[in-house]
């Protein structure tokens, strides 16, 4: 009596159990009573992951520089490519199908956390006692200088955006 | 970021030599890592690279003369058996080395010199 | 694969133009793996152009790659003394280990 399911790694085919093919390969042609299953590896750039009885292989993903893409790992015969995005770039989809470049953050912020290929730059608002006079998506809040260290005085006070000016101590006579 | 290449320096003949290439300010994790050598007065030559789960790949010639490996931080290129024909200036660098990336990262080299 | 650079040598005088030329024995990964480098004594290799044809930071536009496949072209057009240089063109293909670099073209500018 024809099977009606098979084993694992073959698929029914005209009420014959064939092995599938092997990750890397595809199919040419089914099996018969009297032939095994026939595959052949992917070409160049093609790869298929899994057991299958698939007549095409897919072809490796293209990691476009010009969306900011670059190739993290090469695909195989049996893997895709996998795609990251050059440096200063993250992701917009956790499928990471093009890059946007990293934001900065402005005079008066902080970086919280830095950008890494899968996500933005945090920003935080420098507090009292901090500054930032610049654009950058690296750039912490800095403290203050403490002009007491330097035996000196504050002669202008520091805001979120620019440090303390220190200053000779006036000395009485 | 920085790569920078040490470890050369003058052995004799079959005497194994392991090359150290120290990463920083990037994750070996994020790159694959090209091993390429100069022999003095002659052209760049491809040796192998290991991906960013450690599989590796060596030119044709290059196969079971040369061995890549990598820790958190270091990419290693070990010479299993040197002769005077590997004589040659050895550069690390980030990346594949044809790719369509334009941040290519390559070290300054350590030389090796095989001579009995 | 096997990339052949021609000329091996090449004179130029200042403010002309070079062409190099790199064939592959076979066709790079995705038809554009294909970068040119410019390597000057006692430096490593620095990177032109990437992509076949994208230019590299802070390289001058004077210097032109193209083509697709298996055949490319470096064109260095006005050209400066400091162009003197060996140029070498680097292919990735779909295998890893056929990875390899062409012998270098040597530009002496006169």
């Known amino acids: 009596e024809p099977p009606t399911a098979c084993r694992e790694k073959q698929y029914l085919i005209n009420s014959q159990c064939c092995s599938l093919c092997q990750p890397g390969q595809k199919l040419v042609s089914d099996c018969t009573e009297f032939t095994e299953t026939e595959c052949l590896p992917c070409g160049e750039s093609e790869f298929l992951d899994t057991w299958n009885r698939e007549t095409h292989c897919h072809q490796h993903k293209y990691c476009d520089p010009n969306l900011g893409l670059r190739v993290q790992q090469k695909g195989t015969s049996e893997t895709d490519t996998i795609c990251t995005c050059e440096e200063g770039w993250h992701c917009t989809s956790e499928a990471c199908e093009s890059c946007v470049l990293h934001r900065s953050c402005s005079p008066g912020f902080g970086v919280k956390q830095i950008a890494t290929g899968v996500s933005d730059t945090i920003c935080e608002p420098c507090p009292v006692g901090f500054f930032s006079n610049v654009s950058s998506a690296f750039e912490k809040c800095h403290p203050w200088t403490s002009c007491e260290t330097k035996d000196l005085v504050v002669q202008q006070a520091g805001t979120n955006k620019t440090d303390v000016v220190c200053g000779p101590q006036d000395r009485l006579r | 970021q920085s790569v920078e290449e040490s470890g050369g320096r003058l052995v004799t003949p079959g005497t194994p030599l392991t090359l150290t290439c120290t990463v920083s300010?990037?994750?070996?994790?994020?790159?694959?890592m090209t091993w390429v050598r100069q022999a003095p007065g002659k052209g760049l030559e491809w040796l192998g690279i290991i991906d960013t789960i450690g599989s590796t790949y060596y030119a044709s010639w290059a196969k079971g003369r040369f061995t890549i490996s990598k820790t958190s931080t270091t990419v290693d290129l070990k010479i299993t058996s040197p002769t005077t024909e590997d004589t040659a200036t050895y550069f690390c660098?980030?990346?594949?080395?044809?790719?369509?990336?334009?941040?290519?990262?390559w070290g300054r080299g350590t030389l090796v010199t095989v001579s009995s | 694969a096997v990339l052949t650079q021609t000329p091996s040598s090449v004179e130029a005088a200042v403010g002309g133009t070079v062409s190099i030329s790199c064939q592959s024995s076979?066709?790079?990964?995705?038809?554009?793996?294909l970068a040119w480098y410019q390597q000057k004594p006692g430096q490593p290799p620095k990177l032109l152009i990437y992509?076949?044809?994208t230019l590299a930071s802070g390289v001058p536009s004077r210097f032109k790659g193209s083509g697709s496949g298996a055949q490319f072209t470096l064109t260095i057009s006005d050209v400066q003394c400091d162009d003197a240089a060996t140029y070498y063109c680097?292919?990735?293909?779909?295998?890893?280990?056929?990875?390899?670099f062409g012998g270098g073209t040597e530009v002496v500018v006169k």
């Open positions: 680097a292919g990735g293909y779909s295998s890893d280990s056929d990875t390899g």
């Open positions: 076979k066709s790079v990964y995705y038809k554009n793996w």
């Open positions: 660098v980030r990346d594949y080395i044809g790719s369509t990336s334009g941040k290519k990262l």
């Open positions: 992509g076949a044809s």
């Open positions: 300010g990037f994750s070996l994790s994020s790159y694959a």
